[in-house]
Amino acid sequence: AVNGTSQFTCFYNSRANISCVWSQDGALQDTSCQVHAWPDRRRWNQTCELLPVSQASWACNLILGAPDSQKLTTVDIVTLRVLCREGVRWRVMAIQDFKPFENLRLMAPISLQVVHVETHRCNISWEISQASHYFERHLEFEARTLSPGHTWEEAPLLTLKQKQEWICLETLTPDTQYEFQVRVKPLQGEFTTWSPWSQPLAFRTKPAALGKDT
């Protein structure tokens, strides 16, 4: 038997993936555990194997279908269970009635590219990936720019309070290497959280023309 508190947190990417993390502060040695998803209004059910991500934390992804298929809706409720093998039986370690569109975390934005770069400014665009049509334009973004000699944590956050898949960065230093990241969040959902940050996009501003003020 396993003692101690556990935490079971899952997010829906709005299309065909539920990612779950289960933490258990009691010791679990060589125990096989899985997450089981059972929707209330559908015939399918899905299972994924929990794999360790730290000393007392396990994670897995429930793949519900093709990446862009709309496998759940705003009216679905999915019973999620953590099951761990005890001898020949499975023991329920955690359970929750999961409302997918109340627990959203989208995929990180993709296809970041420099549209136009100058000495002091840079226009960057991106795309959202595997986002449901339900959101229409009800998304917001956060962006950050890594300057030389600084860390990502020090970078100020730029907030875009609408579905705007581009940004014009101003007051940059000429002939300087920067990196840029963006993340996305739907406005919908009580427990919705930000997507992971996108892969960083590296760019360099143009050098100042000789003989001109910078």
Epitope: R41, R42, R43
Partner: antibody, heavy 117, light 111 residues
């Protein structure tokens, strides 16, 4: 293997209420959602509504004001009531396993309901 | 007028291949919802032929296959047989209507 058997009157007068019942055999009504679908003569299929064992219902918005679907788990049955019928409600009515978010299988044998005075 | 659009009729000779299309919009097929197909032979109850875009229930011959791309889906019947004659319907979910929707049906004639 789950089978559906439906019954009800084949003739209903205009402005009255159409009533049909479907019995689930070979399985439990508690296992899933159950739907009603209709097909006017020579025409296509139209989803009417659905229910589960606990009585949770969803209806087609175009019929919602006139439709009531109920369930009796002790008899493994679910029922359809459609009020204020007109000739346009003349159709073959089917019960089927499945929610409107899913596919429908199995199907009942169908009941032709004619609305006429 | 059906939410999903199918050709009213298609025909083919025995042994031939026929395709039935099903075109939807941005709130149903194009939104990523699964498409299901039914066969209704003359005077009979509709029968599930394909579920979740491409899957055949047990007992359905592999002459029947289906695919989905963008806002449309297709049912393909190869090696056409006389007993395939009947009506074929596609079905999906529509998030605007919050209801299951069907195509108008396609009558298949085997020449």
């Amino acid at each position: 293997q789950v089978q559906l058997q439906q019954w009800g009157p084949g003739l209903v007068k205009p402005s009255e209420t159409l009533s049909l019942t479907c019995t689930v055999s070979g399985g439990s009504i508690s296992s899933y959602y159950w739907s009603w679908i209709r097909q006017p003569p020579g025409k296509g299929l139209e989803w009417i509504g659905e229910i589960n064992h606990s009585g949770s219902t969803n209806y087609n918005p175009s019929l919602k004001s006139r439709v009531t679907i109920s369930v009796d788990t002790s008899k493994n049955q679910f029922s359809l009531k459609l009020s204020s019928v007109t000739a346009a409600d003349t159709a073959v009515y089917y019960c089927a396993g499945g929610s409107n978010l899913d596919w429908f299988d199995p199907w009942g044998q169908g009941t032709l309901v004619t609305v006429s005075s | 007028q059906s939410v999903l659009t199918q050709p009213p009729s298609v025909s083919g000779a025995p042994g031939q291949r026929v395709t039935i299309s099903c075109t939807g919009g941005s709130s149903n097929v194009g939104a990523g919802y699964d498409v299901h197909w039914y066969q209704q032979l003359p005077g009979t109850v509709p029968k599930l032929l394909i579920y979740d875009n491409t899957n055949r229930p047990s007992g359905v011959p592999d002459r029947f296959s289906a695919s989905k791309s963008g806002t449309s889906a297709s049912l393909v019947i190869t090696g056409l047989q006389a007993e395939d004659e009947g009506d074929y319907y596609c079905q999906s979910y529509d998030s605007s209507l919050r209801a299951s929707v069907f195509g108008g049906g396609t009558m298949l004639t085997v020449l």
